[in-house]
């Protein structure tokens, strides 16, 4: 049994780190493999992660951790029974992929403005809470070329756009993702999309 592509891991900087790797051939990851991880300082538990299959030769493991702090460093040992297949280390603060924002809601009750709001995926005591910026993707359901990205670089998880910048009588969808500038993170996954109908009509004088 051989590792073809070594484990790479990302942390949500909260409670879960996800490691993925590829084996040299078809593998029943949960039956044959174990990923052991331990914080690098004295008196800390060695934890065991049971991986899941991720395609024929791919494995994925979700490592449960307490809230991450910048100096945390984990040793990782990938075992197949009594055989050590790979040994490495992982510093969560250097490989962060934020959680996806949630609760994306579109408010259209103000006639000339579309207000999008969403929730910060972190609690206020998490280091990422005040560091997230967002990208909001809005697209026309009937014309995928009619798509735009709005960068939200302020802290408040809201975006206001003039309804007049969208086509009238058309259904639009929106989704949002996050990244943390000072932690040099990758982008989060996109949130689930939400749909609304743009019923805005220009005032008669402007037609």
């Amino acid at each position: 049994m051989k590792v073809l592509q070594e484990p790479t891991c990302v942390s949500d900087y909260m409670s879960i780190s996800t490691c993925e790797w590829k084996m040299g051939g078809p593998t029943n990851c949960s039956a044959e493999l174990r990923l052991l991880y331990q914080l690098v300082f004295q008196s800390s538990e060695t934890h065991t992660c049971v991986p899941e299959n991720n395609g024929g030769v791919g494995c994925v493991c979700h490592l449960l951790m307490d809230d991450v702090v910048s100096m945390d460093n984990y040793t990782l040992d990938l075992w197949a029974g009594q055989q050590l297949l790979w040994k490495g280390s992982f510093k969560p603060s250097e490989h962060v992929k934020p959680r996806a924002p949630g609760n994306l809601t579109v408010h259209t009750n103000v006639s000339d403005t579309v207000l999008l709001t969403w929730s910060n995926p972190y609690p206020p005591d998490n280091y990422l809470y005040n560091d997230l910026t967002y990208a909001v993707n809005i697209w026309n359901e009937n014309d995928l070329a009619d798509s735009r990205i709005h960068n939200v670089t302020y802290l408040k998880p809201t975006l206001r756009i003039p309804a007049s910048t969208l086509k009238s009588g058309i259904s639009y969808r929106a989704r949002v993702r996050a990244w943390a500038q000072h932690y040099n993170t990758t982008w989060s996954e996109w949130s689930p999309s939400t749909k609304w109908y743009n019923s805005y009509r220009e005032p008669f004088e402007q037609r």
Epitope: F41, S44, E45, L64
Partner: antibody, heavy 118, light 106 residues
């Protein structure tokens, strides 16, 4: 709910040993480590050692030569034994559950009060 | 071993006041610090770990801060149940505790 209940003697003669049993409920010893901490008026809180979920142990170097921690997962019991007791070992001895990946203690036993005296 | 120096050793305050307890480590312990509360005749209870993360069920009037060698625990709007002793604990090798701060009713 999570509970740790301790049993053990209150009075021990100098040079004798202390044995305390910590019986846990609401969680499994196969998933959590259990630490031992003592508290005395003179020395405050002192970490003594831990037995991890996998059965391995770590001890405070100052106590390693006279301390042993073991467990029986099936009975949900952790056993603490300290030898060669002296008067300055008089203290309250606690077992406490390890929290996740951090060696901090999220649930504690009620404590076993030990007096070492002849 | 790393030494933890807590101050003040004792503190008198009234319900509704805000108090701050500090803990200084003899060397860099990053954010590896926890705070516990202990009431008379009871076992300690975890309040904060990783210097600032509140443990489950701990009221939001408690807050931890600091990193490196200087740390503090702040209690806003003291409640009657907050009086007792407070201890810091680092978890670099080996684990050690501060000597404690006794918070009494003024």
């Amino acid at each position: 709910q999570v509970q740790l209940k301790q049993s053990g003697p209150g009075l021990v003669q100098p040079s004798q040993s202390l044995s305390v049993t910590c019986t846990v409920s609401g969680f499994s010893l196969t998933n959590y480590g259990v630490h031992w901490v003592r508290q005395s008026p003179g020395k405050g809180l002192e970490w003594l050692g831990v037995i991890w979920s996998g059965g391995s142990t770590d001890y405070n170097a100052a106590f390693k030569s006279r301390l042993s921690i073991s467990k029986d997962n099936s009975k949900s019991q952790v056993f603490f034994k300290m030898n060669s007791l002296q008067a300055d070992d008089t203290a309250i001895y606690y077992c406490a559950r390890n929290k996740g990946t951090r060696p901090v203690f999220d649930y504690w036993g009620q404590g076993t009060t030990l007096t070492v005296s002849s | 071993d790393i030494q933890m120096t807590q101050s003040p050793a004792s503190l008198s305050a009234s319900v509704g006041e805000t108090v701050t307890i500090t803990c200084r480590a003899s060397e860099n312990i990053y954010s590896y610090l926890a705070w516990y509360q202990q009431k008379q005749g009871k076992s300690p209870q975890l309040l904060v770990y990783n210097a600032k993360t509140l443990a489950e069920g701990v009221p939001s009037r408690f807050s931890g801060s600091g990193s490196g060698t200087q740390f503090s625990l702040k209690i806003n709007s003291l409640q009657p149940e907050d009086f007792g002793s407070y201890y810091c604990q680092h978890y670099v090798s080996p684990l050690t505790f501060g000597a404690g701060t006794k918070l009494e009713v003024k």
